[in-house]
Each structure stands twice: as structure tokens, then as C-alpha cells.
């Protein structure tokens, strides 16, 4: 058994969260993961899941009852979802830690858009898009 | 050139974002984004950008100037990121605006904790380490 | 020991406003939780909304969800009850609460608590 499933569940009796009436109207991240099967679309949902449950555990730092177990089940969180890659987890928290309502952070987030944006397609990043297009253009050029 | 081109031009004017000094002490997203090759990688960094877009343009929706830029480049994020999928970006939306301070939520997002760490790795939702590991067995049995 | 002083409460009518105030005194305030409940008369104490340690947690009553807002100012040592669009069944003494430990807090039981008020009037018309 992994180890964050004893640790979630303490953290269960902590939040009172084993109640059945808990899953009322719904679940939170269950229903919305069981629509997405492609790897990346679920990247998509997980990374803001992920991004919840860090911000939770942030808020919760100081209660010294479920440190252990907040810290047990972030590691885990580490090895599956960044396969214990430091590199991505850092440049992960860098991302969600960056305040909108700071006036810096937004010029540069402006400043960025354009290249943001045109990276956003899954064929913009390796310049395919750009290559199978002059391609085409040369052998209509040819014929 | 695509429509968001001249949108975010307006947009940087706006944010007084378009001199060189917004550039210094490094990049927010670009710098991030080369770090990344890998699809998933690169789905798992755009998720935060994207949602920050979001939520910057939430918190100007009322300054009517900038009103129609930031219509058209969300409709082309909504292109490009969620590839024009309405549901997909639905279930994004939602898990964005999740209040992590709400103890109902709270609750929810616990009792779903073990269920989503066991979704978290690649393999865990198609049952493939599973099966490669039963194969594996199966073989050594068979030497 | 922690002490607890309500204050805020009146007569108004259906549809008005009105803002609670509960005053702490003694030692770590910013270290409890904090509850709202109110009794009617010949009734049970009912819970209201809860705010945790620096705001990290909050709930609310169904009853009241959306026309209430708890907050707390640790400096001050307050935590306050807005309380907007009331409605005759608010009618009640209202009572401001303490609880150091989460499982306890968040399970929203008057007696549970460790500390609480005398209590203040809320009267609303129709």
C-alpha cells in the first residue's frame, strides 16, 4: 500500500471528510477526471488538482497534528505527478505562486503574451506546423 | 496574423507593458516553457499560465478599453489551448474557481484524495503498469 | 482563558443589514477558532459560520449561505458577523464561540466549544 493512504486518512478524520454526506451534490475533481483520457488533456486538469491540494496544504502548514501526513502525501504528489523531478516541481510552484494583483507580475505577463499564445497549440512548440507548410508551398512551387 | 496579435498589442500599451525594462529580472512563462519539450510536461505548465491569463482578465473584465481584447484573446486561447472544446474548458473553469478556503470544498477535495493520487502517474489510468508487470511475471514463469 | 464579548445586535426590519462584533480578551486569540451560533427561543443553540485560524477555513449554515460573511481581525482581536437580507427566522440571541483544535471547529457543535459568550439580541421584523 502506498504510503499517502494511511496519511490521507488521517487527514479524512482531521477534516471530518469520511461523512458519506461529504460526496452531496457531487464530487470536485473525480467526475471532471473520468471525462479526460488523453494524457495531455488530463496534464490540464491535474495541474490545477495538483495546484489545489498544494495551496490547501500551504494553509494548513502551521497544524502541527497533520504535518506529517500533508508532508508524506506531497512527496508522493512529487513522485507520481512530477516523477520526482525537482526541476519541473520548482518551475511548477514558481507558476502558481506569482500574485495576479501584482503590478510587476501583470506587465510581464502582457509583455509575454504574444509568445505565450503562440506556443499554446500542441504543433507550435517543434515548429511542424511551419515545416509540413513550406513543404507544401515547395511542391506546388514544383509542379 | 492571428486575431490575438493586435489584441495583445492593445493590451500592452494598456499595461504600459511594451519598454524594455519589463524584461528585466527574467522571464514569468517563456523561460518555463523551454524547459519543457514533453506534451504532458509542457500541458502541465500551460494549465497555470493559462488559468493566471484567466484570472488577470477576470479582474479587468469592468475597464471597457480593453474590453474587446480581452474577448477575442480568451476566444483564441480557448482555440489553441482548449482546441475549441466548450466542455473541456468548462471543466477547467470549474476547477479553477474552487475556493480553497471553503470547508465544504475542503472536505470534498480530501474524501477525493486517494482516488485522485492513484490517477496521478501516466500508467495509473489505463491499467498499463499492470498489465506489463503480469506479462513480465507471466514470462519469468514460463523460462 | 479567553474571554468573549458580543455586541452589534438590534431590532430591524426584513431586508435590513446589521453587523456583529465579538471582542476577544487574554492570551492567542489568533490561535482558535472561531464560530457563530444563535438559539431561538425554545430551541437548540444552531451553528452559523465558522472561520479558522488567520481565515484558512470558512463554512456557513445553509440557512444563511450568501447573506452572511464571517471575518476576523487578529489584531484587534474581533470577529465580526455581516449579516445582510435578514429574514424574520433570524430572529435569535447570537452567540460568538472559540475552539482551539479543527476536528472539534469544524464539526459546528455549540457545546463542543471550549469558550463563548453572553450572547447578543437580533430581533427582525416582517
Known amino acids: 500500500q502506498d504510503p499517502y493512504v494511511k496519511e490521507a486518512e488521517n487527514l479524512k478524520k482531521y477534516f471530518n471528510a469520511g461523512h458519506s454526506d461529504v460526496a452531496d451534490n457531487g464530487t470536485l475533481f473525480l467526475g471532471i477526471l473520468k471525462n479526460w483520457k488523453e494524457e495531455s488533456d488530463r496534464k490540464i486538469m491535474q495541474s490545477q488538482i495538483v495546484s489545489f491540494y498544494f495551496k490547501l496544504f500551504k494553509n494548513f502548514k502551521d497544524d502541527q497534528s497533520i504535518q506529517k501526513s500533508v508532508e508524506t502525501i506531497k512527496e508522493d504528489m512529487n513522485v507520481k505527478f512530477f516523477n520526482s523531478n525537482k526541476k519541473k516541481r520548482d518551475d511548477f510552484e514558481k507558476l502558481t505562486n506569482y500574485s495576479v494583483t501584482d503590478l510587476n507580475v501583470q506587465r510581464k505577463a502582457i509583455h509575454e503574451l504574444i509568445q505565450v499564445m503562440a506556443e499554446l497549440s500542441p504543433a507550435a512548440k517543434t515548429g511542424k506546423r511551419k515545416r509540413s507548410q513550406m513543404l507544401f508551398r515547395g511542391r506546388r512551387a514544383s509542379q | 496574423q492571428d486575431p490575438y496579435v493586435k489584441e495583445a498589442e492593445n493590451l500592452k500599451k494598456y499595461f504600459n507593458a511594451g519598454h524594455s525594462d519589463v524584461a528585466d529580472n527574467g522571464t514569468l512563462f517563456l523561460g518555463i516553457l523551454k524547459n519543457w519539450k514533453e506534451e504532458s510536461d509542457r500541458k502541465i505548465m500551460q494549465s497555470q499560465i493559462v488559468s493566471f491569463y484567466f484570472k488577470l482578465f477576470k479582474n479587468f473584465k469592468d475597464d471597457q478599453s480593453i474590453q474587446k481584447s480581452v474577448e477575442t484573446i480568451k476566444e483564441d486561447m480557448n482555440v489553441k489551448f482548449f482546441n475549441s472544446n466548450k466542455k473541456k474548458r468548462d471543466d477547467f473553469e470549474k476547477l479553477t474557481n474552487y475556493s480553497v478556503t471553503d470547508l465544504n470544498v475542503q472536505r470534498k477535495a480530501i474524501h477525493e484524495l486517494i482516488q485522485v493520487m492513484a490517477e496521478l502517474s501516466p500508467a495509473a489510468k489505463t491499467g498499463k503498469r499492470k498489465r506489463s508487470q503480469m506479462l513480465f511475471r507471466g514470462r519469468r514463469a514460463s523460462q | 482563558q479567553v474571554q468573549l464579548q458580543e455586541s452589534g445586535g438590534g431590532l430591524v426590519q426584513a431586508g435590513d443589514s446589521l453587523r456583529l462584533s465579538c471582542a476577544a480578551s487574554?492570551?492567542?486569540?489568533?490561535?482558535?477558532?472561531m464560530g457563530w451560533f444563535r438559539q431561538a427561543p425554545g430551541k437548540e443553540h444552531e451553528f452559523v459560520a465558522g472561520?479558522?485560524?488567520?481565515?484558512?477555513?470558512?463554512y456557513y449554515a445553509d440557512s444563511v449561505k450568501g447573506r452572511f460573511t464571517i471575518s476576523r481581525d487578529d489584531a484587534k482581536m474581533t470577529v465580526s458577523l455581516q449579516m445582510n437580507s435578514l429574514k424574520p427566522e433570524d430572529t435569535a440571541v447570537y452567540y460568538c464561540?472559540?475552539?482551539?483544535?479543527?476536528?472539534?471547529?469544524?464539526?459546528?457543535?455549540?457545546?463542543?466549544?471550549?469558550?463563548s459568550g453572553q450572547g447578543t439580541q437580533v430581533t427582525v421584523s416582517s
Open positions: 464561540a472559540a475552539e482551539a483544535t479543527f476536528p472539534t471547529w469544524n464539526r459546528g457543535r455549540f457545546a463542543d466549544y471550549d469558550y
Open positions: 487574554g492570551r492567542s486569540f489568533s490561535s482558535y477558532g
Open positions: 472561520i479558522w485560524r488567520s481565515g484558512v477555513s470558512l
